[in-house]
């Protein structure tokens, strides 16, 4: 009774999708860590099939469905969905665990089903079943929180709609010095919807239901801080809230603080201001500014001024529908093996995009980095030198952005020989794409230096697998050429290889191989 | 092995020009950005210029900009540094520096290969 | 443009664990990758860290890096005698199109 390979099925969720595995009752979001799908055996007549759990996964979610297996040796694969090959690319991870990946993006309706995964290895032949089940978003719903002000009163108050209702919490951070990571110690959670203390530095609200996380920090401009290099742009979309705070400190009380747009001083009852002695008996002044619902004539350069600090502004822009801007040409790179190379992408988008980036039916984490000229930027550094294709992935509520990238490994040729009665024929890989000469071996020329100009045939390129090129050349034999040495060479940047064939033999009889750097 | 190697300091007069040269091997010079990077004596390090792989975007300091000019030739695996109208606090040790990533975007990554510097003098 | 701000000096036992921290004077660092590098009198700068935490290869794990909010950080746990160097905090500031450096810390090794 043959050991079954073990293996472990995984899922992998990406931001927001609100994909889980198990029981259709418990929908659960895993957020970019694997998920253990308890991949079970089945022996059946044809074979093992192994059972994962079946996966949930929200409508417009993205998921990758990931094999690991143990077993050591050369493997092939292949998937199945609704009687469709789709290819499939194992590759090896650094425990030597082969690894055999499927991403499903932006999930509909029409990719839910079973999912089959049939592996050939040295050790077994077995089938692997993926069930993915897609579940209506109108079920399941989380929206950024935004920010009402009380009635009747100086304090803020978070709101965030979903299914099932998300909890809401205030993440506040004081400290100018310290940092404001999440789990820093200038971080205080308030688990209440509504906040009076509205001095701090740092003021964002966050939401959770079991989609995940989303969180809304409250636009501030610092008049004690020097302003940034750029101006700071807030974008909104009609309809959306509007809040917008100005922050001022100063020895004494002796100072006020306004808002204009545009120059024109913003109407009563569309901001508040509160004030507060801190520690060390300076004055904290805020001034908060907001907007139920914008229009677009609520565009424009808002500016906080003040009778004892430079004023500063931010630019307010209101669009219709959200927008992802970046170049989306394809992009080409050539880099040595021990180069290090990442991929990036520079975009502008509202609202915050969720990413991806994806090679060989794997998905990867996306992260993204606001940076001070009001771009963002997510770059992909982990792709092992592998050559091949790489999508990323963008999208927001209401755009999306795909833009391909392809990686070419530099590589010294190869060459393999082959002799049959009539030809001689040298195939090679190696990037950039070889080059051939043929050389002749005789008493006049015992080093093979004396070119063979005649009867060669180079065959372009095929590719057997992404940037594994492979170029083929042979040499057509006259009576004449029966009993010589020959030797095929393939060069290019990184190097050249040679082969030395004798001409008289039927098969395969190449019996010196030359590697000349 | 991976190398940069200054050259073309020395001492120069206020108002006068220098070139400096930095000749790089065992890499492949056109797929990284390249800078300047210099340290007045007992004072930090300071960039001065930096230019893409292919030559075609080149950044300067507020300090220099006007002044010194960055360039590169790729078939030569030579980065270059004209300097005129030096000025007495232009005085430094001049480093050439390469870029942590090939093709990087200059918003990650840092400089991950320096030269051992060649020194510039203005004085009269 | 913003400048970086360090401690000018920061001293510490063999043995013990010390920070570095490095502020913008305006904006937050985390809209920052900072990389880190060690220079010893008389050579030049040496990348320790970059992308806030990586580490290049033959740096040893005792040196770390971490970016948030408002400070950007260079710890070296179980400080040594060959340790004792100034150190520079460096960020790409995208507004301008110039990298900065911060003033730079020397740290001793008591």
């Known amino acids: 009774n043959q050991d079954l390979p073990v293996i472990k099925c995984v899922l992998i969720s990406h931001e927001n999708n609100g994909s889980s595995a198990g029981k259709p009752s418990s929908y659960r979001m895993v957020r970019g860590s694997p998920e253990d799908l308890q991949c079970t055996p089945r022996r059946q007549s044809e074979g093992t099939v192994y059972e994962a759990a079946t996966v949930e996964v929200a409508e417009s979610g993205s998921i990758t469905l990931q094999v690991q297996l143990a077993t050591p040796g050369d493997l092939s694969c292949l998937w199945v969905f609704k009687h469709s090959s789709l290819g499939c690319q194992p590759h090896f991870d650094l425990q030597n665990r082969g690894i055999v990946s499927m991403a499903i993006l932006n999930v509909t309706e029409t990719q839910a089903g079973e999912y089959l995964l049939h592996i050939q290895s040295e050790a077994a032949n077995y089938t692997v079943l993926f069930t993915v089940n897609v579940r209506d978003t109108q079920l399941y719903v989380l929206r950024r929180p935004y920010f009402r002000k009380m009635e009747n009163q100086d304090a803020l108050l978070c709101i965030s709609e979903g299914v099932p209702e998300p909890t809401v919490e205030w993440v506040l951070c004081s400290s100018h010095r310290e940092s404001c990571k999440e789990e820093g110690p200038a971080v205080v959670r308030k688990e209440e919807k509504v906040l009076h203390e509205l001095f701090g530095t740092d003021i964002r609200c966050c939401a959770r239901n079991a989609l995940g996380r989303e969180s809304t920090k409250l636009f501030t401009i610092d008049l004690n801080q020097a302003p940034q290099s750029t101006l700071p742009q807030l974008f909104l979309k009609v309809g959306e809230p509007l809040w917008i705070r100005c922050k001022a400190i100063h020895v004494n009380h002796g100072f006020g603080l306004t808002w204009e747009l545009e120059d024109k001083a913003l109407e009563e009852g569309s901001y508040f201001e509160m004030s507060t002695y801190s520690t060390n008996r300076t004055m904290i002044r805020i001034l908060l500014a907001f907007v139920s619902s914008v229009g677009r004539n609520d565009t424009g350069y808002y500016t906080c001024s003040s009778s004892k600090h430079p004023s500063q502004s931010a630019l307010v822009t209101i669009l219709e529908k959200g927008f992802i801007n970046a170049t989306s040409s394809q992009e080409e790179y050539e880099i040595d093996p021990y180069e290090k190379f990442c991929f990036s992408v520079r975009f502008k988008a509202y609202p915050r995009i969720r990413c991806t980036w994806i090679f060989s039916q794997a998905s990867f984490p996306c992260e993204q980095r606001g940076l001070e000229d009001g771009y963002s930027i997510s770059k992909f550094c982990d792709h092992k030198n592998k050559p091949g294709e790489y999508i990323f992935y963008a999208e927001n509520d209401d755009a999306q952005f795909t833009k391909m990238f392809t990686l070419n490994i530099r590589k010294k040729p190869q060459v393999l020989a082959n002799a049959s009665a009539s030809q001689a024929s040298c195939s090679s890989d190696g990037y950039p794409l070889p080059s051939w000469t043929w050389k002749k071996c005789s008493d006049k020329s015992p080093n093979c230096t004396e070119e063979i100009p005649e009867g060669v045939w180079n065959k372009k390129a095929n590719r057997k697998v992404f940037g594994q090129w492979v170029s083929s050349s042979t040499l057509n034999m006259s009576e004449a050429g029966k009993g010589l040495l020959v030797k095929c060479c393939a060069y290019n940047s990184m190097g050249t290889s040679c082969e030395t064939i004798f001409l008289n033999s039927p098969g395969p009889f190449p019996f010196i191989q030359d590697n000349i750097s | 092995e991976v190398q940069l190697l200054e050259s073309g300091g020395g001492l120069v007069q206020p108002g006068g020009s220098l070139r400096l040269s930095c000749a790089a091997s065992g890499f492949t010079f056109s797929s990284y950005a390249m800078s300047w990077v210099r340290q007045a004596p007992g004072k930090g390090l300071e960039w001065v210029s930096a230019?893409?792989?292919?030559?075609?975007?080149?950044y300067y300091a507020d300090s220099v900009k006007g002044r010194f000019t960055i360039s590169r030739d790729n078939s030569k695996n030579t980065l270059y540094l004209q300097m005129n109208s030096l000025r007495a606090e232009d005085t430094a040790m001049y480093y050439c520096a390469r870029d942590y990533y090939a093709f990087s975007d200059p918003a990650y990554g840092g400089m991950d290969v320096w030269g051992q510097g060649t020194l510039v003098t203005v004085s009269s | 443009n913003f400048m970086l701000t360090q401690p000018h000096s920061v001293s510490e036992s063999p043995g013990k664990t010390v920070t570095i921290s490095c502020t913008r004077s305006?904006?937050?660092?985390?809209?920052?990758?900072v990389q880190w590098y060690q220079q010893k009198p008389g050579q030049a700068p040496v990348l320790v860290v970059y992308d806030d935490s990586d580490r290049p290869s033959g740096i040893p794990e005792r040196f770390s890096g971490s970016n948030s909010g408002n400070t950007a950080t260079l710890t070296i746990s179980r400080v040594e005698a060959g340790d004792e160097a100034d150190y520079y905090c460096?960020?790409?500031?995208?507004?301008?199109?110039?990298?900065?450096f911060g003033g730079g810390t020397k740290l001793t090794v008591l």
């Open positions: 305006s904006g937050s660092i985390a809209s920052n990758y």
């Open positions: 230019i893409g792989g292919s030559g075609g975007s080149t």
């Open positions: 460096q960020v790409w500031d995208s507004s301008s199109d110039h990298w900065v």
